[in-house]
Interface confidence: medium
Amino acid sequence: GALEVQVPEDPVVALVGTDATLCCSFSPEPGFSLAQLNLIWQLTDTKQLVHSFAEGQDQGSAYANRTALFPDLLAQGNASLRLQRVRVADEGSFTCFVSIRDFGSAAVSLQVAAPYSKPSMTLEPNKDLRPGDTVTITCSSYQGYPEAEVFWQDGQGVPLTGNVTTSQMANEQGLFDVHSILRVVLGANGTYSCLVRNPVLQQDAHSSVTITPQRSPTGAVEVQVPEDPVVALVGTDATLRCSFSPEPGFSLAQLNLIWQLTDTKQLVHSFTEGRDQGSAYANRTALFPDLLAQGNASLRLQRVRVADEGSFTCFVSIRDFGSAAVSLQVAAPYSKPSMTLEPNKDLRPGDTVTITCSSYRGYPEAEVFWQDGQGVPLTGNVTTSQMANEQGLFDVHSVLRVVLGANGTYSCLVRNPVLQQDAHGSVTITGQPMTFPPEA
């Protein structure tokens, strides 16, 4: 008879800029109506109101208008809260408090995360290097959360721990930029790798630089961008890195910098006549004005959308000119799949059931894999459909038709091919006759 309020034991991990669902369910008694329900979501520590339902209606968000309930599911005991455009400041514990005649509450932890960008590597000095020279290699990775772990190694995979200085600085959004500096004496040639690990996402971002000491030609404007695509999560900010080599005596009055879409040559952002001319791209771009004089022409693209995906050209002219194109690969993680069974009652071995695995709001299109409890792939009788919404994010629905054995586990894995992120759900069907979901 008691009112049981249930939340996940494990923290909900949410990527900055994405939406998170804080699951909470209660057990309504027969005859329960929403008019009886008081539902409060609040911050556990401060008791600050986040969202509420009372007097038979949703009383709305008290938390920056970024929360929503699932009104159609409340009557079935689903008191889950959707938190939109997650920020670092949202991290913490949220209490779901339900009162009808009885009351109950439970707290769910939100762990916020943001993947670190592929590190950029800079060398100082970066010209006229000879064996025996001491160089400073800087590995910079941006906009991650929580703080990163940084590892250096040489070309043979041997860890480099001496002469490493790592600093991490949080920006206004609470995201960390990590800068790790390795001081090393050059050999005849050498490869130096930097790995930036996000401890929550278990995501590794790495880059390496190979130094072959020799004289390099001078005079030309060398414009450098990352070879690999920049991967940015929908809703987050991305930095399209571009650098050039200013000559001695260079001043910003001499600089023409143009960022444009490679294919259409549509202007994105520009710097000329000694000043930033601003964004021509939906007011979502910015340069790093304090760094331009040192040859940093990188572009910041805010609140990334699926439509931003593509190639951007960084064009620099001083006296000479040069350009390079950098690819932006947009991504969004797929939600943990929800599993449904049809039919879902009185199941017996030999029955044919349809198991649907649904995962939402990912990009690009997912790869879906099914397997049984022994890890054996299930490829027959699988139909997968993917539909893009207005923002270009995909909802994936994969349907497996299977004949039940005495019991069995069926797992669905939804893979984001860009993020190499796997989201999986499984359903175990046992006993006879049986019902899904299992009744409490």
Partner: antibody
């Protein structure tokens, strides 16, 4: 008929402990949340603790947090309030109440039991 | 926690008078409010629940109104047995659900 009967009150020295009981009858005790409300002499009402029907959720007023523990034994139809580290300001009549559907207030109260904390 | 402020703290009135007691919450409590009457040496008695609903057995001269943060208890025509202390209590959010400080209604 719903009945709530408190017991266990009395005189206790500062720093001492006391356990109040509330025997419930006339309704299905295990289906209702319960609360303890106190009233110091000549003062207003203060809800000091509440517990849900299976004892899984408990709440306390800041003034008693860490010192008082509310609990229940549904098999015995009894509600308890364990009070320790008692202070003079805990002197009050303690009422046991039954929580209705929350919008419906506290419809049923016991007669109260007096706790006096004094040296 | 939500604070409940009741006014006035005391009130003198005569039999037959119309009396109004107000209760203000420190934040929106969405009509989750009850009113109680307490006589000396007795336990409180529930009069009104959900801001405006009359508890069974309570005379119809008692009524409640309000929404958001401001609520009112009205006694349309005072009877001798109505002289007592009145309390409001909210039931919004997590416990403890606090009471107002009380209004003592005395005979003029």
């Amino acid at each position: 008929e719903v009945q709530l009967v408190e017991s266990g009150g009395g005189l206790v020295q500062p720093g001492g402990s006391l356990r109040l009981s509330c025997a419930a009858s006339g309704f299905t005790f295990s289906s209702y949340a319960m609360s303890w409300v106190r009233q110091a002499p000549g003062k207003g009402l203060e809800l000091v603790a509440a517990i849900n029907s299976n004892g899984g959720s408990t709440y306390y007023a800041d003034s008693v947090k860490g010192r008082f523990t509310i609990s229940r034994d549904n098999a015995k139809n009894t509600l308890y309030l364990q009070m320790s580290s008692l202070r003079a300001e805990d002197t009050a009549v303690y009422y046991c109440t039954r929580n209705e559907e929350f919008r419906r207030g506290l419809a049923y109260w016991g007669q109260g039991t007096l706790v006096t904390v004094s040296s | 926690d939500i604070q409940m402020t009741q006014s006035p703290s005391s009130l003198s009135a005569s039999v037959g008078d119309r009396v109004t007691i107000t209760c203000r919450a420190s934040e929106n409590i969405y009509s989750n409010l009850a009113w109680y009457q307490q006589k000396p040496g007795k336990a409180p008695k529930l009069l009104i629940y959900a801001a405006s609903n009359l508890q069974s057995g309570v005379p119809s001269r008692f009524s409640g109104s309000g929404s958001g943060t401001d609520y009112t208890l009205t006694i349309s025509s005072l009877q001798p047995e109505d002289f007592a202390t009145y309390y409001c209590q909210h039931f919004w959010g997590t416990p403890p659900w606090t009471f107002g400080q009380g209004t003592k209604l005395e005979i003029k």
